[in-house]
């Protein structure tokens, strides 16, 4: 058993049929010694008396808010949550496996630049009685500070018969060094509580591996005289790290016909312009990627040819 | 470069950008099996990193690029030695046309651009690379190349910025 926060405790249980469970001793937080009784949740049934209560925690029915009283007055509470371990593996019932980039990916994180700011998100089908708490650090043995805000519900989607809820959190490394080569990964830890079930999820990454620039901005076309060619120009996104002579991007320019089956023409360039042939009813799209490190491409910025 | 002269920024930029491309094409190396054998290896803990105080940020480069260039040089020599060690020359064998061969040569090429014959910077002591057990080599290659990708990315940024702003 360990303390998650004040008066909230997590009991770690091996979860299998007829498991013996864990013996837990609760102590009433009071100077009183006599006349103390214990109850669980809303029930008025007295579970025991005395300053301590010993219980055998085996299942969710044994978890909940234990309260010690004296003469009708509440003295203190202890909320017991369960953390299940099945076949040596902690349960992951609360969050949905996003399966990207690999199986057992529950948390996904992205950064728009090298400033040390990043966003993580996760999915669940649970709509009520759900709380999240997020902590983060750079490295684990001698952790350096990363400050995370509160997790908020950022999107709701309907998937077949199910509703899916996306939560996200923003974090900022306290002393970020954008130009340095990271040697210690960022660690993100999410505590999830659904009713009386506790689970924790972690992710470990370097900022460089979760970079995804915003799409290029101010995408413009300039027809070239007496030609089907056009000059496409764009700019670095505002959110990208500066100076651009140091934090450089590379770009992919794509000409795509109306039909998805039509052949796509692609050009790669380090410049912020390119000359392409603009076909009728086609559109021109540009996306960006860090020039020197193959992290994610940005989403496309697009303009129609006409 | 040693003693304060300026490197051939544009040449360094071109070669460092080539190094980035090679480092990504060399990884993941197609081994004979999946990287099933996990386990942390000392070899990758000792790699030199370009850290915050090394002056490789735009301001540091403007003030005095020597500190940064020396750190980059140390790293290039370190990785060049790693790529020639048993980790990469032993079994499972890399094919003759593996990008690792080119990567190895390019690391040497860039380090020589930074430190021509006759000049000597204090080079960091290369840890003695005791031959890893053969079964550890694939995982080590994987880790070393991942680490090298990050190192050469920072080096390439440095040379790109230098070529754009510090070239005579």
């Amino acid at each position: 058993i360990w303390e998650l926060k004040k008066d909230v405790y997590v009991v770690e249980l091996d979860w299998y049929p007829d498991a013996p469970g864990e013996m837990v001793v609760l102590t009433c937080d009071t100077p009183e010694e006599d006349g103390i009784t214990w109850t669980l949740d809303q029930s008025s049934e007295v579970l025991g008396s005395g300053k301590t209560l010993t219980i055998q925690v085996k299942e969710f029915g044994d978890a909940g808010q234990y309260t010690c009283h004296k003469g009708g007055e509440v003295l203190s509470h202890s909320l017991l949550l369960l953390h299940k371990k099945e076949d040596g593996i902690w349960s992951t019932d609360i969050l949905k496996d996003q399966k990207e980039p690999k199986n057992k990916t529950f948390l996904r994180c992205e950064a728009k630049n090298y400033s040390g700011r990043f966003t993580c998100w996760w999915l669940t089908t649970i709509s009520t009685d759900l709380t999240f708490s997020v902590k983060s650090s750079r490295g684990s043995s001698d952790p350096q500070g990363v400050t995370c805000g509160a997790a908020t519900l950022s999107a709701e989607r309907v998937r077949g018969d199910n509703k899916e809820y996306e939560y996200s959190v923003e974090c900022q490394e306290d002393s970020a060094c954008p130009a340095a080569e990271e040697s210690l990964p960022i660690e993100v830890m999410v505590d999830a509580v659904h009713k009386l079930k506790y689970e924790n999820y972690t992710s470990s990454f370097f900022i460089r591996d979760i970079i995804k620039p915003d799409p290029p901005k101010n995408l413009q076309l300039k027809p070239l005289k007496n030609s089907r060619q056009v000059e496409v120009s764009w700019e670095y996104p505002d959110t990208w790290s500066t100076p651009h002579s140091y934090f450089s991007l590379t770009f992919c320019v794509q000409v795509q016909g109306k039909s998805k089956r039509e052949k796509k023409d692609r050009v790669f360039t380090d410049k912020t312009s390119a000359t392409v042939i603009c076909r009728k009813n086609a559109s021109i799209s540009v996306r960006a990627q860090d020039r020197y490190y193959s992290s994610s491409w940005s989403e496309w910025a697009s303009v129609p040819c006409s | 470069v040693p003693g304060g002269s300026s490197p051939a920024w544009t040449q360094c930029q071109q070669l460092s950008q080539k190094l980035c491309t090679l480092a990504w094409s060399a990884h993941p190396l197609v081994g004979h099996m999946d990287l099933r054998e996990e386990g942390d290896e000392e070899t990758t803990n000792d790699v030199p990193h370009i850290q915050c105080g090394d002056g490789c940020d735009p301001q540091g480069l403007r003030d005095n690029s020597q500190f940064c260039l020396q750190r980059i040089h140390q790293g290039l020599i370190f990785y060049e030695k790693l790529l020639g060690s048993d980790i990469f020359t032993g079994e499972p064998s890399l094919l003759p046309d593996s990008p690792v061969g080119q990567l190895h040569a390019s690391l040497l090429g860039l380090s020589q651009l930074l430190q021509p014959e006759g000049h000597h910077w204090e080079t960091q002591q290369i840890p003695s690379l005791s031959p890893s057990q053969p079964w550890q080599r694939l995982l080590l290659r994987f880790k070393i190349l991942r680490s090298l990708q990050a190192f050469v990315a920072v080096a390439a940024r440095v040379f790109a910025h230098g070529a754009a702003t510090l070239s005579p």
């Epitope: - | 004979h32 099996m33 020359t89 032993g90 031959p131």
Partner: antibody, heavy 115, light 107 residues
């Protein structure tokens, strides 16, 4: 074509030393290890050790430490093995071979130790 | 050291037979196992690498299987030219060790 060409047979007296060579051609000498293997007449194979021609790093079978010394010369793409304090137990065919999974083997050097 | 044990020591077969040669390691070597054939007065020749990977130029009738500590070299339809001694080798950890060999004879 890849070839490992080994030096010719040796007949030496007990207590003496011998140095045999293995010249590589057809590939970049520093790209792969050179292993040495011992085979006594009508018997199995024993790994002696290897040298990495890139950095002259060596790895020995404990059994052959003090007996075998592996060296290489990049300029001539040649690996060498010196055997010291020879006894009749050292009479065998000695093979040089590049990485096991490449199947480059020398033709063997026959060593006879006899007074 | 990892001990490699081969069986049988000698195998006498008729051309066209399918034969299996066994190799056992004293501890797990994953799939870091090599098979060699050595004909009389010749250097060993690699037949199989990493337990089951074929080698170009080696007839397809030679196949390898196994992982961990038990390995098999199979010869689909033995030919008179297949005579020789077959060795297995641990390529997993130092020192590299060889099996004692299986001698293949044609009746």
């Amino acid at each position: 074509e890849v070839q490992l060409q080994q030096s010719g047979p040796e007949l030496v007296k007990p207590g003496a030393s011998v140095k045999m060579s293995c010249k590589a051609s057809g590939y970049t000498f520093t790209r792969y290890l050179i292993h040495w293997v011992k085979q006594k007449p009508g018997q199995g194979l024993e790994w002696i050790g290897y040298i990495n021609p890139y950095n002259d790093g060596t790895k020995y079978n404990e059994k052959f430490k003090g007996k075998a010394t592996l060296t290489s010369d990049k300029s001539s793409s040649t690996a060498y093995m010196e055997l010291s304090s020879l006894t009749s137990e050292d009479s065998a065919v000695y093979y040089c071979t590049s990485n096991w999974d490449l199947d480059y083997w020398g033709q063997g050097t026959t060593l006879t130790v006899s007074s | 050291d990892i001990v490699m044990t081969q069986s049988p020591a000698t195998l006498s077969v008729t051309p066209g037979d399918r034969v299996s040669l066994s190799c056992r390691a004293s501890q797990s070597i994953s799939d870091y196992l090599y098979w060699y054939q050595q004909k009389s007065h010749e250097s060993p020749r690699l037949l199989i690498k990493f337990a089951s990977q074929s080698i170009s130029g080696i007839p397809s009738r030679f196949t390898g299987s196994g992982s961990g500590s038990d390995f098999t070299l199979s010869i689909d339809s033995v030919e008179p030219d297949d005579v020789g001694v077959f060795f297995c080798q641990n390529g997993h950890s130092f020192p590299f060790t060889f099996g004692g060999g299986t001698k293949l004879e044609i009746k």
